[in-house]
């Protein structure tokens, strides 16, 4: 049930735009999947320095990509 050949070359080294805008790259299965029920556009790739991961938000909470957002919680999707 994999979604085609798009994948990252290495686990920690993203290839250029490996997924279409409606998709995210799931590291667990190493392929592009639907980003799911996020109600905001997919955020831009994180910068080199990123804050520690945070606990997943509930789906009704905001998941907007603020100026300093690097680690955006996903409501357990996928």
């Amino acid at each position: 049930m994999r979604r085609g050949p798009r994948s990252l070359r290495g686990r920690d080294a993203p290839a250029p735009t490996p997924c279409v805008p409606a998709e995210c790259f799931d590291l667990l299965v190493r392929h592009c999947v639907a980003c799911g029920l996020l109600r905001t556009p997919r955020p831009k790739p994180a910068g080199a320095s990123s804050p520690a991961p945070r606990t997943a938000l509930q789906p009704q909470e905001s998941v907007g990509a603020g100026a300093g957002e690097a680690a955006l919680p996903l409501p357990g999707l996928l």
Epitope: D26, L38, R54, A70, L78
Partner: antibody, heavy 126, light 107 residues
């Protein structure tokens, strides 16, 4: 309260079938991937299967592939594990659990299983 | 399949002791390592995710460290309710795998 309540375990003969259920409450079930994990008596934890929030992807452990089917009914907030061709070695406590993920940029990271059911016992014996 | 080896398999300790449990992966898993506590007859409980992040509601005496192949769970001051079995689990790739556990017993 976030909760997973399991049912459907029991004693079954080798070769027969059984279906486990896991009823979710207290969270948006349809937004979460879900797992089944099992633990044979006195043994290690063994991952069984995972299903995406929308059923678009399903993966299985090698020991159950082709015999077990994971599914879900988001309208009923319920996860299922259909177990066919049961073997003695399938005897275990079965747990359902919620997938814990984080979105970093456009990359989804997996952080394990953050909510677990109480477990249900499956005994395969003739 | 990524194999996780925990050590020791069991240990005896007293209340107030500092306890360290290690988990070694058969290949590099970056920081995708999680720790669980399980008590007899109960489901596992997530303590630490992403090697070092404390799960919500878990006491701060629990901490995790490591990356690559070697990881550690530390309980800074063992409490009576901490006597249990602890498991590591990798979420680097499918199939998910668990260590076989470290049982922490009362000395």
């Amino acid at each position: 309260e976030v909760q997973l309540v399991q049912s459907g375990g029991g004693v079954v003969q080798p070769g027969r079938s059984l279906r486990l259920s896991c009823a979710a409450s207290g969270f948006a079930f349809s937004s979460y991937g879900m797992h089944w994990v099992r633990q044979a008596p006195g043994k290690c934890l063994e991952w069984v299967a995972v299903i995406w929030y929308d059923e678009s992807n399903k993966y299985y452990g090698d020991s159950v592939k082709g015999r077990f089917t994971i599914s879900r009914d988001n309208s009923r907030n319920t996860l299922y594990l259909q177990m066919n061709s049961l073997r003695d070695e399938d005897t275990a406590v079965y747990y359902c659990a919620r997938r814990f993920t984080n979105l970093r940029g456009w990359i989804i990271e997996d952080y394990g299983l953050d909510v677990w059911g109480q477990g249900t016992t499956v005994t395969v014996s003739s | 399949e990524i194999v996780l080896t925990q050590s020791p398999s069991s240990l005896s300790a007293s209340v107030g002791d500092r306890v360290t449990i290690t988990c070694r992966a058969s290949q590099s898993i970056s920081s995708y390592l999680n720790w669980y506590q399980q008590k007899p007859g109960k489901a596992p409980k997530l303590l630490i995710y992403a090697a070092s992040s404390l799960q919500s509601g878990v006491p701060s005496r629990f901490s995790g460290s490591g990356s690559g192949t070697d990881f550690t769970l530390t309980i800074s001051s063992l409490q009576p309710e901490d006597f249990a079995t602890y498991y590591c689990q990798q979420s680097y790739s499918i199939p998910l795998t668990f260590g076989c556990g470290t049982k922490v017993e009362i000395k």
